[in-house]
């Protein structure tokens, strides 16, 4: 239980002239005080106490969670898709009503043809993964399906799937335009109506670096930013050195503040440094003492 | 699952004439597509006659008039009457189906095979 503690204040005033006031306790009172949360006020900026140390919260590190680190971890994710929502007319196959049943026969045998059809007019494209049919209707047999791309991720996979799916776009539609019947009679493993060719929808897998590295560094977000090394994002502060964006502190040590890096400078022996990148070296004079 | 067990292949004169028969296990002989196919040594395998469950027939233009695709519900059998045989008529011949209603010639688009019968034409 925490206990009253009755309390006297005493004034003071600074050099300043401003009044201070501080507790003063009464002491001929015995107290018994459990410490509740004190170590939390230890924990700055939404840091927590995990009962050995402060569990600092990023941008933020060190024993009270009152620095800021150089870099922020962000992962890309290893690969990137794109989803091509398409529809092809299917004309060497007529419509029954059990290819609406994906668990059929009908259906099997349908989605089996249709996946090595469509795997032979896509077997150039590198990002190319497969296709999946999401439904069937009549007329002769129209194909709503996905064809899906993925690549390893780097800066460009956007450009990367974009092209991907042209490719695609280019494909189907020479595929559709050559295999068609003649005469009711399709030599192909399947034959198309060239007009019911019809890409729906293109979805591409969205990941912004740029985006996660603001997120992340908070309210420090303005002066974080990704410097790209062998393809990979890295999220720094320009306190991280070895990038194009770090800067140079000479004789100092950088240090994030919320007006951005600031460059805190050494005193030697010899010199006092100064200057914004602590590059300024002013020498100190020598006394000599006589007895 | 539709099995298939192809018969009747055997060595004829030119002129000649043969009636080869494929019986099919399973449920699904009054649907679909079935054909019969060949293979000559060295050469790819092709569609000889082919019929479908909603009327459509096909038949290659060098059988067309003396080849006859049919089917027997009832005992779940195609049969291939080959007439005025050729020499060039020789190869393996299988028959074929797919729960589809197929209008391809296209081997790689029937899933399912009986195993072959060999047809010589020879004097």
């Known amino acids: 239980p925490l206990a009253t503690i009755p309390v006297s204040t005493t004034s003071l005033t600074s050099s300043e002239g401003s009044t201070i006031s501080t507790p003063s306790v009464d002491i001929s009172t015995p107290v018994t005080t459990s410490i509740v949360g004190d170590q939390c006020s230890r924990c700055k900026n939404g840091g927590f106490w995990d009962g050995l140390k402060c569990q600092c919260l990023t941008p933020y590190y060190g024993e009270s969670c009152e620095e800021v680190v150089n870099s922020i971890d962000i992962a890309p994710p290893e690969t990137v898709s794109a989803q091509m929502e398409l529809t092809v007319t299917v004309t060497s196959v007529k419509f029954t009503d059990e290819l609406k049943n994906h668990s059929s026969q009908e259906f099997r045998e349908f989605n089996k043809t249709f996946t090595e059809q469509m795997n032979i007019v896509y077997s150039g494209i590198p990002e190319y993964v497969g296709v999946n049919i999401t439904n069937l209707r009549l007329g002769s047999v129209v194909v709503e399906h996905d064809v899906l791309l993925r690549t390893k991720y780097t800066p460009e996979y956007k450009t990367a799937l974009d092209n991907a799916t042209e490719v695609v776009k280019q494909k189907i539609t020479k595929v559709t335009t050559e295999q068609i019947m003649t005469n009711d009679n399709c030599s192909a493993l399947m034959c198309f109506n060239t007009t019911g060719t019809q890409v729906q929808n293109i979805t591409v897998t969205q990941y912004d670096p740029v985006e996660e590295c603001r997120q992340k560094a908070e309210e420090y977000e303005d002066y974080f930013l990704v410097e790209y090394r062998d393809q990979k994002p890295y999220c720094i502060s320009p306190c991280e050195s070895g990038f194009n964006a770090s800067k140079n502190c000479n004789h100092g040590k950088c240090q994030m503040s919320q007006n951005g890096a600031r460059c805190l400078c050494v005193t030697t022996e010899t010199h006092w440094y100064s200057g914004e990148d602590c590059n300024q070296g002013t020498q100190k004079s020598h006394h000599h003492h006589h007895h | 699952e539709v099995q298939l067990q192809a018969s009747g292949g055997g060595v004829v004169q030119p002129g000649g004439s043969l009636r080869l028969s494929c019986a099919a296990s399973?449920?699904?002989?009054?649907?679909?597509?079935w054909g019969w196919f060949r293979q000559a040594p060295g050469k790819e395998r092709e569609a000889v006659a082919l019929?479908?469950?909603?009327?459509?027939?096909f038949y290659a233009d060098s059988v067309k008039g003396r080849f006859t695709i049919s089917q027997d519900n009832s005992k779940n059998t195609l049969y291939l009457q080959m007439n005025s045989l050729r020499a060039e008529d020789t190869a393996v011949y299988y028959c074929?189906?797919?729960?589809?209603?197929?209008?391809?010639?296209?081997?790689?688009?029937?899933?399912?095979w009986g195993q072959g019968t060999m047809v010589t034409v020879s004097s």
């Open positions: 019929i479908s469950s909603d009327g459509w027939t």
């Open positions: 074929a189906a797919s729960v589809l209603v197929l209008r391809t010639l296209n081997p790689k688009a029937w899933h399912h």
């Open positions: 399973g449920d699904t002989f009054s649907r679909g597509s």
